[in-house]
């Protein structure tokens, strides 16, 4: 039962991580600039994301502009975009693999194969968690580097945006969720196939209960 609980918690955390990653990638709040113009006394915030940048006036009015040409974009931004999309797709792949191995599905009937699929999905989620970290940490590093660079003008300096914090949260959730799924399988693995039959008995329509198997097979 502990294994089942770990799996449920793992997949819930993973789903939350995926949603966070999606919002993080979509929001134009990776880099945030707060400044008061030298000549015009109008406070404004500039939000920069992977897909667009927005200018928010003190009046609350917001104007967003989608980046025109992909080729004209800086290489780090192109890489961050690519990693974001790849990560989101990898998580979806992981979810499909998990569903194939989940206790409540009949895609795969062999209990060992099912447990292996859950383990694979966990590994996929851990990898996606690491991939999520890359563009987020990369961007944060460039923001911090600019902040301490004396030749970068104040107007060009940025602050860490909400998307970066969401990205870190997403990465943490994916790593934790994936880790729990891996743990669920490894903890099950120590108890041998008997444990997996208990776990997966609901997914195999005509399987016998554990007590009906001769114990000599599990020595």
């Amino acid at each position: 039962m502990a294994s089942t609980g770990l799996q449920i918690l793992g997949i819930v955390l993973t789903l939350l991580g995926w949603v966070n990653a999606l919002v993080s990638c979509a929001l134009p709040m990776w880099k945030v600039t707060a400044f008061i113009g030298n000549s015009i006394v109008v406070a404004q915030m500039v939000w920069e994301g992977l897909w667009m940048s927005c200018v928010v006036q003190s009046t609350g009015q917001m104007q967003c502009k989608v980046y025109d040409s992909l080729l004209a974009l800086p290489q780090d931004l192109q890489a961050a975009r690519a990693l974001c999309v790849v990560t989101l797709l990898i998580v979806l792949l992981g979810l499909l693999v998990y569903l194939a191995g989940a206790k409540c599905t009949t895609c795969v009937e062999d209990r060992n194969s099912k447990s292996r699929l859950v383990l694979i999905s966990g590994i996929i989620f851990v990898i996606s968690g690491v991939l999520t970290l890359i563009p987020v940490c990369w961007t944060a590093h460039s923001i911090i580097q600019d902040f301490y660079n004396p030749l970068v003008a104040d107007a060009q300096k940025r602050e860490l945006g909400a998307s970066l914090y969401l990205g870190w949260a997403a990465s943490g959730l994916l790593l934790l969720g994936g880790g729990l799924l891996c743990c669920a399988c490894s903890s099950g693995g120590t108890q041998g196939p008997r444990h997996y039959m208990a776990c997966y008995s609901t997914s195999v329509p005509h399987s016998r209960g554990p007590s009906e198997y001769p114990t000599k097979n599990y020595v």
Partner: antibody, heavy 119, light 107 residues
Framework: EVKLVESGGGLVKPGGSLKLSCAAS????????MSWVRQTPAKRLEWVVT????????YYPDSVKGRFTISRDNARNTLYLQMSSLRSEDTAMYYC????????????WGQGTLVTVST | DIQMTQSPASLSASVGETVTITCRAS??????LAWYQQKQGKSPQLLVY???LLVDGVPSRFSGSRSGTQFSLKINSLQSEDVARYYC?????????FGSGTKLEIK
Amino acid sequence: EVKLVESGGGLVKPGGSLKLSCAASGFTFNSYTMSWVRQTPAKRLEWVVTISSGGGRTYYPDSVKGRFTISRDNARNTLYLQMSSLRSEDTAMYYCIRGDYRYDGFAYWGQGTLVTVST
Amino acid sequence: DIQMTQSPASLSASVGETVTITCRASENIDSYLAWYQQKQGKSPQLLVYASTLLVDGVPSRFSGSRSGTQFSLKINSLQSEDVARYYCQHYYSIPYTFGSGTKLEIK
């Protein structure tokens, strides 16, 4: 109008010392990063040192570290460069530079003061 | 240290022509590059920063571009007042270094 006037240059023997000054006017001195950049007789530009607006952070290349010291007096709107253990390769025109709020890099340059290190 | 290799060392062109000065960084500097113009007997002046952004008051015939670690300063429709030395400079990390300069003359 931004005005930067350097002074203190001259002829000095190798191993000697010299103190350059830069009088700033036309802007709020304590709001800007300041730097010194030199231009050798061969017309090469070399970054010498940078100091933060408050004076708390200084940045030097290895070539002058330990020999040159930058400082600023925000009350007097003056930037200083204390140069010691001077070498012949330090012979150059020294420019005082102000950073900018909008532009990266060395935005406003003074007219320069010539330092000649020779026997 | 990051080395900035600027070319050509000197350049002669006619009024109205388009000229391009290039600068290559020895390693990645992102877009942390500035271009300066120094007229005879004067102090250098900032023209371009962040590799492509023009300083206010600089004529639009000047433009900066980047391709990886190679940067270019292009002057369209060359004017007689553009006769000067041009320098590139990176500010990616300490120490900040300049290119060796390009002397631009009018034929």
